[in-house]
């Protein structure tokens, strides 16, 4: 069996970066995207970015989402650009929390 | 072609710098990750570190980490190591290469010795 | 980190005879998404390495089909099924499942006797 592009490691996916960890990047690059949505004193805390290396992100990608926080990923060039993790508020909204985006 | 030529290499005294770089042509150099892989005399092949696509994310081998910098310019098809507090163990040809490894330069032989 | 083994260090074959090399890594270099990264390299005195194997059995373009790779998790094979001349050198196993971090095997040589 022949390829013309050999595969010696995993692909790496473009991923748009936003919150603390990005520092002045707007994007990185790495084997998993992702989009969270935690809460720290009252603040819905969103962030994005990416798993550089697969096991980092395997646990938290399979954890499903709690009250206090939610990480969707996904794998593909910048496929974490339109993606919103949601927490399980069930319709319901929890009172006194504001919506921050960390930068 | 695809074509890259390592330069910069030399003899170094112990705790010394030295900055390798990568001229790159023949294809996109900003559509693909670059590896810098080193060769120590007689021996086997050691992996020290890598760079994206853009100089987003970089990684070290434990080896070289803390001491040695991966940089690249897409504008100038360039890729470097910057190369501080030398050992002598770091005595090596290092070699530029494009993934998926298909394409390596020659290699540049740096010499750490008082 | 992933240690890769080769045995045998060296090979020392008859032109038209077969060789074969072996890698051994510490942990099973299978990825979660479902492709096993263990390439194997050749590397003529003087030279860079030259890219011959990927995903433990895909050649690569132009090289030559008497080159097979084989195995699954934690054993791995590379033969040449008549070694010919220009196939002296030192090979290498190279893992790259753990990506960004890559490990090579110490290589094994070839020679002919």
């Known amino acids: 069996m022949e390829d013309e592009k050999p595969k010696v490691n995993p692909k790496l996916y473009m991923c748009v970066c936003e919150g603390l960890s990005c520092g002045n990047e707007d994007h990185c690059e790495g084997q998993q995207c992702f989009s969270s949505l935690s809460i720290n004193d009252g603040f819905h805390v969103y962030q994005k970015g990416c798993f550089q290396v697969y096991e980092q992100g395997k646990m938290t990608c399979k954890t499903p989402p709690s009250p206090g926080q939610a990480v969707e990923c996904c794998q593909g060039d910048w496929c974490n650009r339109n993606i919103t993790a949601q927490l399980p508020t069930k319709g319901k909204s929890f009172p006194g929390t504001q919506n921050f985006h960390l930068e | 072609q695809v074509q890259l030529v390592e330069s910069g290499g030399g003899l170094v005294k112990p705790g010394g710098s030295l900055r390798l770089s990568c001229a790159a042509s023949?294809?996109?150099?900003?559509?693909?990750?670059m590896s810098w892989i080193r060769q120590a005399p007689g021996k086997g092949l050691e992996w020290i570190s890598f760079?994206?696509?853009?100089?987003?994310?970089?990684y070290y081998a434990d080896s070289v980490k803390g001491r040695f910098t991966i940089s690249r310019d897409n504008a100038k098809n360039s890729l470097n190591l910057q190369m501080s507090s030398l050992r002598a163990e770091d005595t090596a040809v290092y070699f530029c290469?494009?993934?998926?490894?298909?394409?390596w330069g020659q290699g540049t032989l740096v010499t750490v010795s008082s | 980190n992933v240690v890769l083994t080769q045995t045998p260090i060296s090979s020392p074959v008859i032109l038209g005879q077969p060789a074969s090399i072996s890698c051994r890594s510490s942990?099973?270099?299978?990825?979660?998404?479902?492709?096993?990264?263990l390439s194997w390299l050749h590397q003529r005195p003087g030279q860079p390495p030259r890219l011959l194997i990927y995903t433990v059995s895909n050649r690569v373009s132009g090289v030559p089909d008497r080159f097979s790779g084989s195995g699954a998790g934690t054993d791995f094979t590379l033969k040449i099924s008549r070694v010919e001349a220009e196939d002296v050198g030192v090979y290498y196993c190279m893992q790259g499942t753990q990506f960004p971090a890559l490990t090579f095997g110490g290589g094994t040589k070839v020679e002919i006797k």
């Open positions: 290469a494009r993934e998926p490894l298909q394409h």
């Open positions: 942990q099973s270099l299978v990825h979660s998404d479902g492709d096993t990264y």
């Open positions: 023949g294809f996109t150099f900003s559509d693909y990750y």
């Open positions: 760079i994206s696509r853009t100089g987003s994310t970089k």
